[in-house]
């Protein structure tokens, strides 16, 4: 425990030092005798509420509202040209595509492309040189159980987010699955039993890992439920950075 | 951390009595600072409902007990000066803040700050130079449904972990949401129908992505349910590393 | 898509991506390991197969990654679990799933959890379920440190190169 690291390393304390040591020791003992039982009792008293009162939403409504704004317009800055001129990197943020699809924004807000990386929704992300890249992705999902059903839980939905290599220099073969994550959500039906929509649920499916990529290979994200993607700011993004 | 605000502000203590008083006071304070958190963590570790081992026996009891100790004292090392001296990086580990808040530890255990990165709970993480940073965060949550309710599932709770930028070159405006994860948990009520607390649930909300930051901008974590954070080792952390 | 069912695609086995010589920059220590799909009741890490590799000093010994030089490393790992729906007659048993990356170092007398995630899963009546856990962070590591993983729920792992992996790279 923490106290074990507190052993004295100096020589023997004498005279006045002994008195100080005695005072320190006594004080420490008394403090321990008082502090430990009181703390034990306090913690035991608090544990149930602490673990159980968990169901109320304590989130600051202001913060929530701000988060909920999604793509609020911020003063747009061009990424400075002098930032990391030699490092192929990209960060793309999810944006709704016509027809309920998931598209990606490469220049707005926090998104950027550096050092020759190229991106478009149709082509995906192309890295400008051979190398070892750390690829990452997070997709936020949201939804609610549709009306109906006798059980308190609706039909499960399994959300998958996957990162593939395809096209370009990789060629026309089967796109190669690089990294993927998945989450099964079982929405709660209308708790009031009014056969209405269930409460909103949220989840995020994310991952990241090292992949050796060649110049001209393309990387793209594939998701199972584009209609459930949460486009609120910061929730859905993917990117790459060369690390070797 | 909570203790950091306890620095003495008074003038110099004089005379032998003053010295004894100072020693007694300091010893008492140090003992309290060690005893109270250690006792809290020990009690939390031992309270039955607090660990998942009671819900299923697939969890390694040894590992569980070890996790439950949270901040047990490890041989503290100064980060070596020769470790990547030019690379601004930080890894901060979640620690309980007075009043059920989420604080961050910057020097204990695996936590570190290198190359001019600065951190305080009040102001967040400040990076020393312009650049491209990979920012990451993982917050472990835990809880149990409170007693009561006719349905087998309790009220849903949506857990959010968010990373914001503020201050510095970014200016005094609204903090900017950079990255965010969310997870809706619907706790299962007492399966035995005894109107007791439901079984413990666990989840983690994490993310990571590239962000272009300017010197002096501050990055901080905001979470929806600080009372539900799991402080077991390795569960809750955030950090940044400059990649270009 | 290939692997939509979270299984290795034919493409992965048919066309292994050749390793490239990174002539443009000095190699940095890096590793990416995948769970061995042939071992169903344990999580054994494999290198030098599919997209897994060990680079510039990293080695794999006793299912642990050995850190080649002191420095700051980004360490990451992912697992994906799956399971079947329970039958209406059965009592749904909660399932405890956990994944942890641990550090074993000469400086500590025990394995230190670096990255840890837990989940209680309540299998539903209707469909099979999937759950992934990913985490990654930067750590100051010392030459000779060992990085390993501990997983609860191994029988439920979906072992494929895209779903179960463990890696690290020097920054």
């Amino acid at each position: 425990m923490g106290a074990l690291g507190l052993e004295g390393r100096g020589g023997r304390l004498q005279g006045r030092g002994s008195l100080l040591l005695a005072v320190a020791g006594a004080t420490s003992l008394v403090t321990l005798l008082l502090a430990v039982p009181i703390t034990v009792l306090a913690v035991l008293a608090l544990v149930p509420q602490d673990q159980g009162g968990l169901v109320t939403d304590t989130a600051d409504p202001g913060a929530q509202a701000q988060q909920g704004l999604g793509f609020q317009k911020l003063p747009e800055e061009e990424p400075e040209a002098d930032l990391s001129p030699g490092l192929p990197a990209a960060h793309l943020i999810g944006a709704p595509l016509k027809g309920q699809g998931l598209g990606w924004e490469a220049t707005k807000e926090q998104a950027f492309l550096t050092s020759g990386t190229q991106f478009s929704d149709a082509e995906g992300l192309a890295l400008p040189q051979d190398g070892l890249y750390y690829l990452y992705c997070l997709v936020g999902y949201r939804g609610r159980a549709p009306p109906g059903g006798a059980e308190p839980r609706g039909r499960s939905v399994t959300l998958r987010s996957s990162l593939y290599r395809a096209g370009g220099a990789y060629g026309p073969g089967t796109p190669e699955l690089l990294l993927e994550g998945a989450e099964t959500v079982t929405p709660v039906l209308d708790p009031a039993g009014r056969q209405g929509y269930g409460p909103l649920w949220y989840t995020s499916v994310g991952f990241g890992g090292l992949v050796q990529l060649r110049r001209g290979e393309r990387v793209y994200v594939n998701i199972s439920h584009p209609d459930m993607v949460d486009f609120a700011r910061g929730k859905t993004f993917f990117g790459a950075v060369m690390v070797g | 951390m909570g203790a950091l605000g306890l620095e003495g502000r008074g003038g110099r203590l004089q005379g032998r009595g003053s010295l004894l008083l100072a020693v007694a006071g300091a010893t008492s304070l140090v003992t309290l600072l060690l005893a109270v958190p250690i006792t809290v963590l020990a009690v939390l570790a031992l309270v039955p409902q607090d660990q998942g081992g009671l819900v299923t026996d697939t969890a390694d009891p040894g590992a569980q007990a070890q996790q439950g100790l949270g901040f047990q004292k490890l041989p503290e090392e100064e980060p070596e000066a020769d470790l990547s001296p030019g690379l601004p990086a930080a890894h901060l580990i979640g620690a309980p803040l007075k009043g059920q808040g989420l604080g961050w530890e910057a020097t204990k255990e695996q936590a570190f700050l290198t190359s001019g990165t600065q951190f305080s709970d009040a102001e967040g993480l400040a990076l020393p130079q312009d650049g491209l940073y990979y920012l990451y965060c993982l917050v472990g949550y835990r809880g149990r449904a409170p007693p009561g309710g006719a349905e087998p599932r309790g009220r849903s709770v949506t857990l959010r972990s968010s990373l914001y930028r503020a201050g510095g070159a970014y200016g005094p405006g609204t903090p900017e949401l950079l990255l965010e994860g969310a997870e809706t948990v619907t706790p299962v009520l007492d399966p035995a129908g005894r109107q007791g607390y439901g079984p413990l649930w666990y989840t983690s909300v994490g993310f990571g992505g590239l962000v272009q930051l300017r010197r002096g901008e501050r990055v901080y974590v905001n979470i929806s349910h600080p009372d539900m954070v799991d402080f077991a080792r390795g569960k809750t952390f955030f950090g940044a590393v400059m990649v270009g | 898509l290939p692997g939509v069912g979270l299984t290795p695609s034919a493409a992965q086995t048919a066309r292994q991506h050749p390793k490239m010589h990174l002539a443009h920059s000095t190699l940095k220590p890096a590793a990416h390991l995948i769970g061995d799909p042939s071992k169903q009741n344990s999580l054994l890490w494999r290198a030098n197969t599919d997209r897994a590799f060990l680079q510039d000093g990293f080695s794999l010994s006793n299912n642990s990654l050995l850190v080649p030089t002191s420095g700051i490393y980004f360490v990451y790992s992912q697992v994906v679990f799956s399971g079947k729906a329970y039958s209406p007659k059965a009592t749904p048993t909660p399932l405890y799933l956990a994944h942890e990356v641990q550090l074993f170092s000469s400086q500590y007398p025990f394995h230190v959890p670096l990255l840890s995630s837990q989940k209680m899963v309540y299998p539903g009546l209707q469909e099979p379920w999937l759950h992934s856990m990913y985490h990654g962070a930067a750590f100051q590591l010392t030459q000779g440190d060992q990085l390993s993983t501990h997983t609860d729920g191994i029988p439920h792992l979906v072992l494929s190169p895209s779903t179960v992996f463990f890696g690290a790279f020097a920054l």
């Epitope: 220099a169 026309p172 793209y220 584009p226 | - | 290939p2």
Partner: antibody, heavy 116, light 107 residues
């Protein structure tokens, strides 16, 4: 063996719509994107758009966004293209082609003639 | 949109000849160039992707080269089965566009 079998020729009146199909076999249908092209008589090829059979996401050449609607039926491993408000300008041979960008297999083509 | 120009719309050559068909893009397409062969019956086949990579099953008599905006397809040792129209296509920037085609005939 990979095959893309397209539906037969169509003769339609101006202003009408037509739905042509491309039946895929011999490979995992959801594993590859499906592209559609058109070739007017004696002219070059034009790329209309592409659909992801896995989730129905589609990309269109802006020129065709109000002309074509791409859909898939996973159960029958068939891709469809509906052509709307046809004019004589839309008379052409329409091809489906499998691939993310380079298309390694093409259908035999479907001839659409718009005439009153 | 990126314009693809095949300056030679038709050419004729003798069996055994070496033939080069060129293609120019209106802007840099970073090697994202594909070549297709369309036979007189309308059948279309992929020959080359990413400027120079030969698609499986395509004879090595076919080769591609180029960079930036200028690309070419070369057929060596011309055979009767090579009679077709050859199209280049850029897949660098959406929407993808094809060249006008080059019709190859045997003298």
């Amino acid at each position: 063996e990979v095959q893309l079998q397209q539906s037969g020729p169509e003769l339609v009146k101006p202003g009408a719509s037509v739905k042509i199909s491309c039946k895929a076999s011999g490979y995992s249908f959801t594993g590859y994107f499906m592209n559609w092209m058109r070739q007017s008589h004696g002219k070059s090829l034009e790329w209309i758009g592409r659909i992801n059979p896995y989730n129905g996401d589609s990309f269109y050449n802006q020129k065709f966004k109000d002309k074509a609607t791409l859909t898939v039926d996973k159960s029958s491993t068939t891709a469809h293209m509906e052509l709307l408000s046809l004019t004589s300008e839309d008379s052409a041979v329409y091809y489906c082609g499998r691939g993310y960008d380079a298309m390694d297999y093409w259908g035999q083509g479907t001839s659409v003639t718009v005439s009153s | 949109d990126i314009q693809m120009t095949q300056t030679t719309s038709s050419l004729s050559a003798s069996l055994g000849d070496r033939v080069t068909i060129s293609c120019r893009a209106s802007q840099d397409i970073s090697n994202f160039l594909t070549w297709y062969q369309q036979k007189p019956d309308g059948t279309v086949k992929l020959l080359i992707y990413y400027t120079s990579k030969l698609h499986s099953g395509v004879p090595s008599r076919f080769s591609g080269s180029g960079s930036g905006t200028d690309y070419s397809l070369t057929i060596s040792n011309l055979e009767p089965g090579d009679i077709a129209t050859y199209y280049c296509q850029q897949v660098s920037k959406f929407p993808w566009t094809f060249g006008g085609g080059a019709k190859l005939e045997i003298k």
